[in-house]
Interface confidence: medium
C-alpha cells in the first residue's frame, strides 16, 4: 500500500509545509543555496506558532542554526530572503541584548531561546523551507509511511 | 533601581495639543531590545495602548489614533515624549509610560509609571 | 486588530476561594500574553508573561496557562492582598489589553 507523505524523506510537516533541519554545517550565503538545489528556500518565519515550532527543534538540538534573515543590504532593517521586513511582533524573538551587530554580525540565527544575529561566513546548520505536497495529483509524491514527526506544543 | 516618571500638563482644553514626556532611569533606550510604551486609562475604565518607540527609533501608533500621535526619544536625556493632537473630553483619562524588556520572551510591559492624571475640559 | 475578552467581568469571592479569570483572544497568538493586576489609583503590575511564566517576586499561588486563542489566569487560594482588578494583554501583533475582571469580596 502506497501511502502519501506530504514531505520528502527527513523533512518534518508543519501547518502545510516541509522543513529540512540540516546535519551538516555551511556558512549563510551557501545555506541559501543549499535550500535553493533542493527546491526550498532558507527558512522566513511567518507566524509566531512557526516560529514557535523551529526554535523548538533548533534549541532541542542544541544546534546554532541559520534561518533566511538578515540585515546586509542596510544595517539595522532587518529582511527576510524572500524580501518581506521583519514584522514589529518578531521583534520579541531576539535573545536579551541582540541584534548587537557586534564584528559586522548580519545575519540571524537560532540560538538558544531565541534569535542572534553572527558573521554570515560562520559555519552553521541551517533550515530549508518549501510548501508541502497535497498528494492530489499523480506527480505528488507516494511514499512509504515516514517516521511520524507529530507537532509539538507551542514553548 | 528602575524608574518611569510621567509628566505633563493635568489640564488642557478641547482642540489643544498634550505634549507628555516619560523620564526613566535605570536602563538605556540605546539597549537592544528595550521599548517603551505609552498605555492611557480613562477613568473607570480599560487599559488602552496607544504608542511604541523601540530602541532602534522604530515607532507604532494604535491604529484608531495613530493620525493624532507622535512618540519620539532623546536617549541622552532618557525621555520619551508622546503628543496627542486635537484633544477631545473622552481623552480624559489617566496617562502611563511602561518599558519592555529585552530578551525573547515577549514585549510586554514589566515595569510602569505611576500615571498622569489629563483632564480635557473647557 | 487583535481583541481580547476576558470574562467574566466582575467575580465575587472569599479569601481562600480558588479563582479563574478566562481570556479568549479573537485570532491565535500562541503563547504571547501577559497578566496584569491593578488596584484603584495604582499603575498596573506584572504578573505573568508569555502566558504562564511568573514574573520574579510574584507569589506562586498566580498561575497562568493557554495557547492560541484561550487563557487563564488561577489564583489558587485568595489572599485579601488579591482583591484587584486584573487584565490580560496580548503583544502578538502589536499590543491590545482585554476589558478587565474587578475580583471583589463576596
Known amino acids: 500500500e502506497r501511502l502519501c507523505h506530504p514531505c520528502p524523506w527527513e523533512w518534518t510537516f508543519f501547518q502545510g509545509n516541509c522543513y529540512f533541519m540540516s546535519n551538516s554545517q555551511r556558512n549563510w550565503h551557501d545555506s541559501i543555496t543549499a535550500c535553493k538545489e533542493v527546491g526550498a528556500q532558507l527558512v522566513v518565519i511567518k507566524s509566531a506558532e512557526e516560529q514557535n515550532f523551529l526554535q523548538l527543534q533548533s534549541s532541542r538540538s542544541n544546534r546554532f542554526t541559520w534561518m533566511g534573515l538578515s540585515d546586509l543590504n542596510q544595517e539595522g532593517t532587518w529582511q527576510w530572503v524572500d524580501g518581506s521586513p521583519l514584522l514589529p511582533s518578531f521583534k520579541q524573538y531576539w535573545n536579551r541584548g541582540e541584534p548587537n551587530n557586534v564584528g559586522e554580525e548580519d545575519c540571524a540565527e537560532f540560538s538558544g531561546n531565541g534569535w542572534n544575529d553572527d558573521k554570515c561566513n560562520l559555519a552553521k546548520f541551517w533550515i530549508c523551507k518549501k510548501s508541502a505536497a497535497s498528494c492530489s495529483r499523480d506527480e505528488e509524491q507516494f511514499l512509504s509511511p515516514a517516521p511520524a514527526t507529530p507537532n509539538p506544543p507551542p514553548a | 533601581q528602575v524608574t518611569l516618571r510621567e509628566s505633563g500638563p493635568a489640564l488642557v482644553k478641547p482642540t489643544q495639543t498634550l505634549t507628555l514626556t516619560c523620564t526613566f532611569s535605570?536602563?538605556?533606550?540605546?539597549?537592544?531590545?528595550?521599548?517603551v510604551s505609552w498605555i492611557r486609562q480613562p477613568p473607570g475604565k480599560a487599559l488602552e495602548w496607544l504608542a511604541l518607540i523601540d530602541w532602534d527609533d522604530d515607532k507604532y501608533y494604535s491604529t484608531s489614533l495613530k493620525t493624532r500621535l507622535t512618540i519620539s526619544k532623546d536617549t541622552s536625556k532618557n525621555q520619551v515624549v508622546l503628543t496627542m493632537t486635537n484633544m477631545d473630553p473622552v481623552d480624559t483619562a489617566t496617562y502611563y509610560c511602561?518599558?519592555?524588556?529585552?530578551?525573547?520572551?515577549?514585549?510586554?510591559?514589566?515595569?510602569w509609571g505611576r500615571g498622569t492624571l489629563v483632564t480635557v475640559s473647557s | 486588530d487583535i481583541q481580547l475578552t476576558q470574562s467574566p467581568s466582575t467575580l465575587s469571592a472569599s479569601v481562600g476561594d480558588r479563582v479563574t479569570i478566562t481570556c479568549r483572544a479573537s485570532q491565535s497568538i500562541s503563547n504571547w500574553l501577559a497578566w496584569y493586576q491593578q488596584k484603584p489609583g495604582k499603575a498596573p503590575k506584572l504578573l505573568i508573561y508569555?502566558?504562564?511564566s511568573l514574573e520574579s517576586g510574584v507569589p506562586s499561588r498566580f498561575t497562568g496557562s493557554g495557547s492560541g486563542t484561550e487563557f487563564t489566569l488561577t489564583i489558587s487560594s485568595l489572599q485579601p492582598d488579591d482583591f484587584a482588578t486584573y487584565y490580560c494583554q496580548q503583544y502578538n501583533s502589536y499590543w491590545t489589553f482585554g476589558q478587565g475582571t474587578k475580583v471583589e469580596i463576596k
Open positions: 508569555k502566558a504562564s
Open positions: 535605570g536602563f538605556s533606550l540605546s539597549t537592544s531590545g528595550i521599548s
Open positions: 511602561a518599558r519592555t524588556p529585552s530578551g525573547s520572551y515577549g514585549r510586554y510591559f514589566d515595569l
